[in-house]
């Protein structure tokens, strides 16, 4: 018999209740505070959506996102000579993705084992903080990148140290902002033991009192300040960019740039449609329903939307591909299992043979190609 005070708590949010009833399991008597969940919550926590679908998606995100963002960060830090603002923003984007994706094995294990968290409260808080932090970091760095791309078209002036320093300052400000806005996620107790299911949940079940007002207000503020406003800026930048590209004269080089810009716009649009808009919209709707009705009928959609939001870690490398010449080269060669140095040597060798009569030797001193911005 479990005798306890069983309080309502709702997770990801399901409401669980503190249970003060005598719960007969035939395993003897203990006295403790017990959290209980309703039948809907129990069906979600034991169902295939959370124990099969989520781990499959997270595995894909981990397998694709870790190497691609890892390579991107390496390219931007060590293989790109000129640290243009775009490179700085993309490096930060890659770092944000990596900080989120490295915890995915724990997340995958958690869901596969029936939403049972065995890694302690601190790791759960880190995982959740980084999960949401990554989404909002991605939105902000994507906004910076989009505005910067537009700025480059409007003012096609050379790279200056001052611009790079401004980009570094903005990046640091974004990290600080995200750290501040995710503090509540680190402070709130995210792990709750559900005796009836014999599992410890991480973020999936939260006390009713917390969920009802606080979570709605929190995610509504984030949706307005860290999603809607940056989304508006991003959209404006791309609308203006399209206008500029349409009106500009078209030589072969400009056409290439225009096509790449359009691909970038489509990629960012896809990211907003798949990752950011559904998750932010459903975060607000889900918590609003809990606040107003004590239950959420969109919970399954909400879970899927949050899960899809992690796909931004897989889509970001496409952004790097369309923006960075260096990343493009390294990505192509990585897929062809060749090093950039090997390719360059081949190119140098071919060039040398062509001009052997005119010039006796030709060598490349750099393995880094100029990045076009």
């Amino acid at each position: 018999t479990i005798q306890g005070t069983n309080r309502s708590s709702k997770g990801r949010s399901l409401i669980g209740k503190v249970d003060g009833t005598s719960h007969v399991t035939g395993k003897g008597v203990t006295v403790e505070t017990v959290f209980s969940v309703d039948e809907f919550s129990a069906s979600v926590l034991t169902g295939k959506l959370t124990t099969v679908f989520l781990p499959i998606v997270y595995t894909i995100v981990f397998v694709v996102g870790l190497p691609s963002n890892g390579m991107a960060l390496w390219v931007f830090l060590f293989r790109t000579k000129k640290k243009h603002p775009a490179v700085i923003y993309m490096a930060n984007l890659a770092l944000a993705d990596l900080l989120s994706v490295i915890w995915f094995p724990l997340k995958i294990a958690y869901h596969i084992h029936g939403n049972n968290w065995i890694y302690g409260e601190a790791l759960c808080n880190v995982l959740i903080g980084f999960f949401y932090g990554n989404m909002y970091c991605s939105i902000l760095f994507m906004t910076c990148l989009s505005v910067q791309r537009y700025w480059v078209i409007v003012n096609p002036m050379g790279h200056s140290r001052k611009k790079a320093n401004i980009a570094i300052g903005i990046s640091l400000a974004i990290w600080l902002l995200i750290l501040l806005v995710t503090i509540p996620l680190y402070v709130v107790k995210q792990t709750i033991f559900i005796p009836a299911l014999n599992i410890t949940t991480c973020h999936d079940v939260l006390p009713e009192q917390l969920l009802v007002g606080d979570m709605f207000n929190y995610f509504l503020s984030l949706a307005i300040g860290v999603f809607l406003f940056p989304a508006f800026l991003t959209a404006s930048a791309y609308v203006l960019m399209i206008r500029m590209l349409r009106s500009s004269a078209m030589d072969e080089n400009s056409e290439k740039k225009r096509k790449r810009a359009i691909k970038l716009i489509v990629t960012v649009l896809a990211m907003y449609l798949i990752c950011f808009t559904p998750s932010n919209l459903l975060l607000v709707v889900h918590y609003f329903l809990i606040k107003s009705q004590g239950q959420s009928h969109v919970y399954a959609l909400y879970i899927v939307a949050l899960c899809l939001s992690t796909l931004n870690s897989c889509i970001d490398p496409f952004v790097y591909y369309f923006v960075s010449h260096d990343f493009r080269d390294h990505a192509k060669n990585a897929l062809l299992c060749r090093s950039v140095r090997t390719v360059k040597q081949m190119q140098v060798s071919l060039t040398s043979k062509k001009h052997s009569r005119k010039s006796s030797s030709y060598s490349s001193s750099s393995t880094t190609v100029k990045t076009s911005y």
Partner: antibody
């Protein structure tokens, strides 16, 4: 339409036993937690027992006043809920209602018409 | 267990009037309060859940609201068929507990 129909009530002597039944229809019975709630003559409502769904391993819960005397059980294949009452006391005299707990844990959304238990010598 | 106190055992009103039935929780239950109606000789029926949400088929003259741990069920434009016992119930913490009930009488 959700329907809960209780049966099995009657007159029993103190320390006697009786089993109440509740036939459920109009909803997916196996997905819901079910309760027994009673109402003594001229009195308020008192929760008696609760049984969870298969997802929660049919966990059972009891009010302190009936613990170790009453047993709640269910048969999902027949959409039936039961309350086995042993060692009955005169204070167990009441109308017993079979109640469905909302799927989202939001209170009791449907009640049966009730069955009367009288414990008297 | 959480105690739900309905201070008025009886309340008298006339058809067309507005009446408010109150209930107080002994501790914080958030918004997890429901109201049930029990007409003479019948079983209870759910009227309101989560403080102010009407259950399926409940007329909109029934409204609920909360102020801290105080909960109110208001019936505007009272009808003769509203003659019944009204019970509040908390479902924030198991076991779910009920108020002792308020009998609404029609003058």
């Amino acid at each position: 339409e959700v329907q809960l129909i209780e049966s099995g009530g009657g007159l029993v002597q103190p320390k006697g036993s009786l089993k109440l039944s509740c036939a459920a229809s109009g909803f997916t019975f196996n997905s819901y937690a079910m309760h027994w709630v009673r109402q003594a003559p001229g009195k308020g409502l008192e929760w008696v027992a609760r049984i969870r769904s298969k997802n929660v391993h049919y966990a059972t819960y009891y009010a302190d006043s009936v613990k170790d005397r009453f047993t709640i059980s269910r048969d999902d294949s027949q959409s039936m809920l039961y309350l086995q009452m042993n060692n009955l006391k005169t204070e167990d005299t009441a109308m017993y209602f079979c109640v469905r707990e909302d799927y989202y844990g939001s209170s009791y959304d449907y009640w049966g018409q009730g069955t009367t238990l009288t414990v008297s010598s | 267990d959480i105690v739900m106190t309905q201070s008025h055992k009886f309340m008298s009103t006339s058809v067309g009037d507005r009446v408010s039935i109150t209930c107080k929780a002994s501790q914080d239950v958030g918004s997890a309060v429901a109201w049930h109606q029990q007409k003479p000789g019948q079983s209870p029926k759910l009227l309101i859940y989560w403080t102010s949400n009407r259950h399926t088929g409940v007329p909109d003259r029934f409204t609920g609201r909360r102020s801290g741990t105080d909960f109110t069920l208001t019936i505007s434009n009272v009808q003769s068929e509203d003659l019944a016992d009204y019970f509040c119930q908390q479902y924030s913490t198991y076991p779910f507990t009920f108020g002792s009930g308020t009998k609404l009488e029609i003058k």
